[in-house]
């Protein structure tokens, strides 16, 4: 009788991560008596995948009923394949022995290749806000894909960026890979509504490339411009001084009025007007009773925006032309409900 052969018909198979892999193995004879075992890898460090006689292998099922007397099919199915399952699998026939079974013959092996999709790209920006004209870095990361080939592109508002560096790790062979890219973006005053997009394309993706986004509204700080102006009011001896705070982002803003260096009133910006570009305007006004002042008054509008050092704009109020009224006080008015967009 011809000597038993272990036949693994598939030299290689490829499986998508999450699917099942069927590893085929048949023997040509029932003799010698003894079990079949499946291993990943060869040599002393090989990993036992399935033992016909003993052990618990929750992800492995046999394709045919091994308890049947004349069974010669020892194919197995491994469920929920991950990239870590990649490797060469050997179907090995053992001869019954005492106390241990003796390896009799091995199949030629089946190489299992696993294709896995990249994870959704995650884009992260700088920890601190930056102002227009500054260059900021964004990073994009995606993990767990196989094979290694992958393309990554950066876009700002649909326009492809060219200033970026990308690495795919590890450099050598691995069961799965990660990609890391850093892009440099120059901020402009119009970037409040802008988006930075990282786009990853891979052979496993049936749809369009995967995209990760970052909103520049979380990165940019647009400092305000200030303008202090004076308007007469109907009531004699009263002057309305307004401070227009224009084109700032984010909203967090505190305004202080100073009269000759002394704090007159502090208020926090509440009802803001949003501009088309996403920045905000705000207007505060101060009603000054000029008869309360003998000398000219220096009015200062001081703005602290988003925790940054204060910026200010001053206005000299000439009082010499007005008749003096003893004992009257400065009457600060409330901030206007809204300011017209510029």
């Amino acid at each position: 009788e011809e000597e038993l052969q272990v036949i693994q018909p598939d030299k290689s198979i490829s499986v998508a991560a999450g699917e099942s892999a069927t590893l085929h193995c048949t023997v040509t004879s029932l003799i010698p008596v003894g079990p079949i075992q499946w291993f990943r890898g060869a040599g002393p460090g090989r990993e036992l995948i399935y033992n016909q006689k003993e052990g618990h292998f929750p992800r492995v099922t046999t394709v045919s009923d091994l308890t049947k007397r004349n069974n010669m099919d020892f194919s197995i199915r491994i469920s929920n394949i991950t990239p870590a399952d990649a490797g060469t699998y050997y179907c090995v026939k053992f001869r019954k022995g005492s106390p241990d079974h003796v390896e009799f013959k091995s199949g030629a092996g089946t190489e299992l290749s696993v294709r896995a999709k990249p994870s959704a790209p995650v884009v992260s920006g700088p920890a601190a806000r930056a102002t227009p004209q500054h260059t900021v870095s964004f990073t994009c990361e995606s993990h767990g894909f196989s094979p290694r080939d992958i393309t990554l592109k950066w876009f700002k508002n649909g326009n492809e960026l060219s200033d970026f560096q990308t690495n795919v790790d590890p450099a050598g062979d691995s069961v799965s890979y990660s990609i890391h890219s850093t892009a440099k973006v120059v901020l402009t005053r119009e970037d409040v509504h802008s988006q930075v997009i990282c786009e990853v394309a891979h052979v496993t993706l049936q749809g369009d490339p995967l995209r990760g986004t970052a909103n520049l509204s979380e990165t940019i700080r647009v400092p305000p411009t200030l303008e202090v102006t004076q308007q007469p009011v109907r009531a004699e001896n009263q002057v309305n001084v307004t401070c227009q705070v224009r084109k700032f982002y984010p909203q967090r803003l505190q305004l202080t009025w100073l009269e000759n260096g002394n704090v007159s009133r502090t208020e926090t910006a509440s009802t803001l007007t949003e501009n088309k570009d996403g920045t905000y305007n705000w207007m505060s006004w101060l009603l000054v009773n000029v008869s309360a002042h003998r000398d000219d008054v220096k009015l200062t509008c001081q703005v602290e925006h988003d925790g940054q050092p204060a910026v200010s704009k001053s206005h000299d109020l000439k009082v010499s032309a007005h008749p003096k009224e003893q004992g009257s006080n400065t009457a600060p008015g409330p901030a206007l409900a809204s300011a017209a967009p510029l």
Epitope: H202, V203, Q206, D208
Partner: antibody, heavy 116, light 109 residues
Amino acid sequence: VQLVESGGRLGQPGTSLTLSCTVSGFSLSSYVMGWFRQAPGKGLEYIGIISSSGSPYYASWVNGRFTISKTSTTMDLKMNSLRSEDTATYFCARVGPLGVDYFNIWGPGTLVTVSS
Amino acid sequence: DIQMTQSPSSLSASVGDRVTITCRASQSINSYLAWYQQKPGKAPKLLIYSASFLYSGVPSRFSGSGSGTDFTLTISSLQPEDFATYYCQSWHYISRSYTFGQGTKVEIK
């Protein structure tokens, strides 16, 4: 799983023609689909694909003359400004479940003849 | 665009012969190469994908090898039903585009 092309016929140069690929046994929203053609006695030529989400991508030679679109069960190829060199059998195909680098299911093809 | 050069363009062989068809890419396509069989008046049929993986239901006499730019389709023992035209097809992962070789017609000697 089946693909069937339709719409192939004799067309005049300069006119337009729309071919359809009707699928059964799977969802078009899960796979990339492609259009190919083969002129009589010649080799296979790639025209374009449409992604599972509906974005089309074309071979560089197409130059806007062909448009690929899809509904829930059909994928269409609209051909404008027909030329005699567009005479071919047109095939639709589905990419494999493991990735977009190969096509494992093909329709039988539909013949387009462009002649005056 | 990538060019795929297939050779020979035709060959004559007998049943039982070992047949080898080669395909060369103008630039590296790693292992993104498929082989198809086409018979007259029929649609192409997938034989091999990812350069070396046998598609389900395809007889084991068909095998593929190669990576980078040079690829081979081998039929170990030609059968009567194997007389057909064979095409290689590449996919380029950067341009995400497909290119076919010009075909190899396998005829009966």
